[in-house]
């Protein structure tokens, strides 16, 4: 039950996180005009990964896309790449985790397979979250550098240099959305990895080997099997981790890497 809850919660947290990463990537407010200690302007500038916008006091907002690839700073391209990789990995992770959910039955999928998929999706969520956090942090670092390096009458924009009165930029809402979303995706991924441990067989499941003693038959088995006597009707060896739902004759189990997580 706890495993199902952990897995389900991990999935939901990751889902929210990835939605947040997508939202942050699409948002225009990655950097916003710094209003502190600046002359009061009747225009408010803000920039995203894909376009820059200007909101006027009139109520009119004008946004212009960055229609060049080569003219954009390498750092901006790197941030874009990190965010897109994060989204793609997160999306694949979500897809995998849906099939890995313990509460969803797909044919005769084994728990070990579900455990495998849960771990895979967990790792994907962790990497996705790290990509988002890294992307947002790189952009934030770029902003801080530009903020302090800016001179009195020159502004180095996303696409070049313009001789004008200094417009300084500070952290926009998208950065905070990105950090939180990346963190949530990371937490969700960790939860999925924890859930994977509970889903996996607890011990190594080798085929039982019986040794017959002179008095009565006792089956000595490694790890995951109870030693059962030869008396009575229960002559089958049953696994203890699933309450004896299936016998070793019904399903053949092999050692899995998840047993050692």
């Amino acid at each position: 039950m706890a495993v199902t809850a952990c897995q389900g919660l991990g999935f939901v947290v990751s889902l929210i996180g990835i939605a947040g990463i997508i939202a942050a990537t699409c948002m225009d407010q990655w950097s916003t005009q710094d209003l502190y200690n600046n002359p009061v302007t009747a225009v408010f500038n803000y920039q995203g990964l894909w376009r820059s916008c200007v909101r006027e006091s009139s109520g009119f907002t004008e946004c212009r896309g960055y229609f060049t690839l080569l003219g954009l700073p390498a750092m901006l391209q790197a941030v874009r790449a990190l965010m897109i990789v994060g989204i793609v990995l997160g999306a694949i992770g979500l897809l995998v985790s849906i099939f890995a959910l313990k509460c969803i039955r797909i044919g005769s999928m084994e728990d070990s397979a579900k455990a495998n998929m849960t771990l895979t999706s967990g790792i994907m969520f962790i990497v996705s979250g790290l990509c988002a956090i890294a992307g947002v942090s790189v952009f934030a670092n770029m902003l801080v550098t530009n903020f302090w390096m800016s001179t009195a009458n020159m502004y180095t924009g996303m696409g070049g240099m313009v001789q004008t009165v200094q417009t300084r930029y500070t952290f926009g809402a998208a950065l905070f959305v990105g950090w939180v979303a990346g963190g949530l995706t990371l937490i969700g991924g960790v939860m999925m990895c924890i859930a994977c441990r509970g889903l996996a067989p607890e011990e190594t499941n080798y085929k039982a080997v019986s040794y017959h003693a002179s008095g009565h038959s006792v089956a000595y088995k490694p790890g995951g099997f109870k030693a059962s006597t030869g008396f009575g009707s229960n002559t089958k060896n049953k696994k203890i981790y699933d309450g004896g739902a299936r016998t070793e004759d019904e399903v053949q189990s092999y050692p899995s890497k998840h047993d050692y997580v």
Partner: antibody, heavy 118, light 113 residues
Framework: EVQLVESGGGLVQPGGSLRLSCAAS????????MSWVRQAPGKGLEWVAT????????YYPDSVKGRFTISRDNAKNTLYLQMNSLRAEDTAVYYC???????????WGQGTTVTVSS | DIVITQSPSSLSVTLGERATLSCRSS????????????LTWYQQKPGQAPRLLMY???TRESGVPDRFSGSGSGTDFTLTISSLQPEDFATYYC?????????FGGGTKLEIK
């Protein structure tokens, strides 16, 4: 057609108060910033106040700050200018204007005259 | 505050001639975010409300004849009327619409020579 009609002007004594109104029609009032501009007799134009579309931000020049208050009622499509502690130098024709691209004053009312005199 | 200086204060031009009105700002009115200059030109005739001619320094307002053109960037701007018509004789104001307080120039009165 965009129409702006000012009212509320008149003769007032120094130190007195007056409230100007500007009734707007022909456009979505709640989507535009609005301003008041005045022109003293035989003088140039002077910006008096600006309010953004939702009324959340207001701006004034030092000459009227603390004495004049711009406000709007988007439900009534009306812009207001509350003028307190009036001085002789506030005598002018007051125009209300709709802001447009580039924060330009695209549409103007016909003006209302305010005379501050004892 | 931004100081807007218009020159000349009055200008006498013959009908059909070109008129060039100048406007200078004490600070750059160029916004780096959209590379637009926040300078506006108005025309005002006696007893009438001002009329918008140009915004963003060089964009003509709809309905304004194409004989009116605006140019300049940063701090120096020009309004040019290529061939003066009788209805063009009026007072012209330029305005800073970038910084608060929005400031108007003193105006240029265009008269028939």
């Amino acid at each position: 057609e965009v129409q702006l009609v000012e009212s509320g002007g008149g003769l007032v004594q120094p130190g007195g108060s007056l409230r100007l109104s500007c009734a707007a029609s022909g456009f979505t009032f709640s989507s535009y910033g609005m301003s008041w501009v005045r022109q003293a007799p035989g003088k140039g134009l002077e910006w008096v106040a600006t309010i953004n579309s939702n009324g959340g931000s207001t701006y004034y020049p030092d000459s009227v700050k603390g004495r004049f208050t711009i406000s709007r009622d988007n439900a009534k499509n009306t812009l207001y200018l509350q003028m307190n502690s009036l001085r002789a130098e506030d005598t002018a024709v007051y125009y209300c204007a709709r802001l447009s691209y580039g924060n330009s004053f695209a549409n103007w009312g016909q003006g209302t005259t305010v005379t501050v005199s004892s | 505050d931004i100081v807007i200086t218009q020159s000349p204060s009055s200008l006498s031009v013959t009908l059909g001639e070109r008129a060039t009105l100048s406007c200078r700002s004490s600070q750059s009115l160029l916004n780096s975010g959209n590379h637009r200059n926040y300078l506006t030109w108005y025309q005002q005739k006696p007893g009438q409300a001002p009329r918008l001619l140009m915004y963003w320094a060089s964009t003509r307002e709809s309905g304004v004849p194409d004989r009116f053109s605006g140019s300049g960037s940063g701090t120096d701007f020009t309004l040019t009327i290529s061939s003066l018509q009788p209805e063009d004789f009026a007072t012209y104001y330029c305005q800073n619409t970038y910084y608060y307080p929005f400031t108007f120039g003193g105006g240029t009165k265009l008269e028939i020579k």
